[in-house]
């Protein structure tokens, strides 16, 4: 297949809404449940998500929501928050009207004339906010995740089916399949579709084999494929890296723990703005790279790579992607240089002599099967041929 075309690289930030919402066909999602197919029902009202009113929640709406989310039908109505006939008592006659307050605080309702999402509509201020919220557990409690890839947008593909997390076999696994995964998870588009052993092998069942998505499906389980077969082992677990995944490296220093900060995001390496590159950001990066703590933030060079990233951390985050971040914002970066850092584990701090490497490219063979090219004595980047 041709690879899916990446969307335009707009200015983006961690605070923005997901690129793709699971309930695209119906402005609804389930939260605080065991998976994306169970939980409290929330509906989208313009820019915000609001809990759906429990008083008007019925089996038709539950069925419609589950179907719209690709989660099969709803479980028995007894599993829903039961409607309570005893509503808050009406005010005594002659009391001051509280209609304005009630309406301002009113909760939206998802009202359905049938069990199909096309027959539903969101009605604003349909209920008083009495604390009862619509909940549902769908029959096919399906979910999807990427694991062991250093973030929610990269890793081994796992599906939740019949209460068990399981892998997907890498037979016929390609960018179209990975694209569906990335979009379903709100992780942008697929940068890589990876065969087995790029990530740690999974355990448990293998739920799918011979997956063959067109790339247009909303859910991975909508793609043609076969149930996981016995001849597919965990050494063949499919993986994906999505455009919204961030990974980092330091280049141009004595080793991997010193140099210019670069982030791989949306398919390319980008520099980081030093205008807000403070000790807290440097500390998070050094720790996440396994390079100890930040010792110094040397003066950077002008930006040379295509995109620019800005981070703002409190210093306690595990990785820079957990910090507040913004991408390709020219205002933030226009006066900045490319951030650099020296981490405590760098050998340049320990006065260890660095052997000279000729500037010309060296080719080194390791274990007779892997050829490594050392391109540049500054960055010492290892690239598999």
């Amino acid at each position: 297949h041709p690879s899916p075309a990446p969307p335009d690289q707009l200015n983006t930030s961690s605070a923005e809404s997901e690129l793709w919402e699971p309930g695209e066909r119906l402005p609804v999602r389930l939260t605080n449940g065991s998976s994306s197919c169970s939980g409290t029902v929330e509906v989208r009202l313009e820019a915000s998500w609001e809990p759906a009113c429990g008083a008007l929640w019925d089996s038709r709406a539950a069925e419609a929501v589950c179907r719209a989310l690709g989660c099969g039908g709803a479980e028995a109505a007894s599993q829903l928050a039961p409607p309570t006939p005893e509503l808050p008592p009406p005010p005594a006659a002659g009391n001051t009207s509280v209609a304005a307050n009630a309406t301002l605080a009113g909760a939206p309702a998802l009202l359905c004339s049938g069990a199909e999402w096309r027959l539903c509509e969101v009605v604003e201020h349909a209920c008083r906010s009495d604390g009862r919220r619509a909940r549902v557990t769908c029959a096919e409690n399906r979910a999807l995740r990427l694991v062991d890839g250093g973030g929610a947008c990269a890793g081994r593909v796992e599906m939740l089916e019949h209460g068990e997390w399981g892998s997907v076999c890498d037979d016929t696994w390609d960018l179209e399949d990975a694209h569906v995964v990335c979009r379903q998870l709100g992780c942008g588009w697929a940068v890589q579709a990876l065969p087995g052993l790029h990530f740690t092998p999974g355990r448990g069942p293998i739920h799918r084999d011979q997956v063959n998505c067109s790339g247009a499906e909303a859910y991975l389980w909508d793609c043609p494929g076969l149930p996981g077969q016995h001849y597919c082992g965990h050494k063949e677990d499919a993986g994906a890296v999505c455009s919204e995944h961030q990974s980092w490296r330091l280049t141009g220093g004595a080793d991997r723990c010193e140099g210019q900060v670069e982030v791989h995001f949306r398919g390319v390496w980008n520099t980081v703005c030093d205008s807000e590159w403070y000790p807290s950001e440097a500390k998070v990066l050094c720790q996440s790279l396994g390079c100890g703590t930040a010792v110094e933030r040397p003066k950077g060079l002008p930006h040379s790579l295509s995109g620019r990233m800005y981070y703002s951390c409190n210093g306690e985050e595990l990785t820079l992607s957990n910090c507040s971040w913004r991408f390709n914002n020219s205002n933030l970066c226009s006066q900045s240089l490319a951030a650099r850092v020296l981490c405590s584990a760098s050998r340049s701090l320990h006065n260890l002599s660095t052997p000279e490497v000729p500037a010309s490219v060296q080719t080194v063979t390791i274990e007779s099967s892997v050829t490594v090219k050392i391109e540049n004595k500054e960055s010492r980047e290892l690239m598999l041929l």
Epitope: P90, A93, G106, A109, C127
Partner: nanobody, 123 residues
Framework: QVQLVESGGGLVQPGGSLRLSCSAS????????LGWFRQAPGKEREFVAA????????YYADSVKGRFTISRDNSKNTLYLQMNSLKPEDTAVYYC????????????????WGKGTLVTVSS
């Protein structure tokens, strides 16, 4: 106790129009979401239309969408149902309903029912 009194029912030809009214005794009328249900001979009561406290949100049964319009005038303590392009299958007793906690779309949230007014659509 809210007293709901419907009026405006009667006999009308197919394709014709009627306007139902529902007046309420309660001074806190604006604290209630209001609506209309109907019951045809030999059938169960069914939802027709609902409106929230101040009239900002409305909801209609699929069978009446585009033909019926619900509205309210809080200054007159009155609820209206404008019925256009009437069909024989709209023949029913129409009930005005009031609900404190939610728009009266499902029967379990309804606090008060009127006694009903008969609408007959026939040539």
């Amino acid at each position: 106790q809210v007293q709901l009194v419907e009026s405006g029912g009667g006999l009308v030809q197919p394709g014709g129009s009627l306007r139902l009214s529902c007046s309420a005794s309660e001074r806190t009328f604006s604290d209630y979401a209001l609506g209309w249900f109907r019951q045809a001979p030999g059938k169960e009561r069914e939802f027709v239309a609902a409106i929230n406290w101040v009239g900002g949100s409305t909801y209609y049964a699929d069978s009446v969408k585009g033909r019926f319009t619900i509205s309210r005038d809080n200054s007159k303590n009155t609820l209206y149902l404008q019925m256009n392009s009437l069909k024989p299958e709209d023949t029913a007793v129409y009930y005005c309903v009031a609900s404190w906690g939610a728009m009266p779309v499902l029967t379990h949230v309804i606090n008060y029912w009127g006694k009903g007014t008969l609408v007959t659509v026939s040539s």
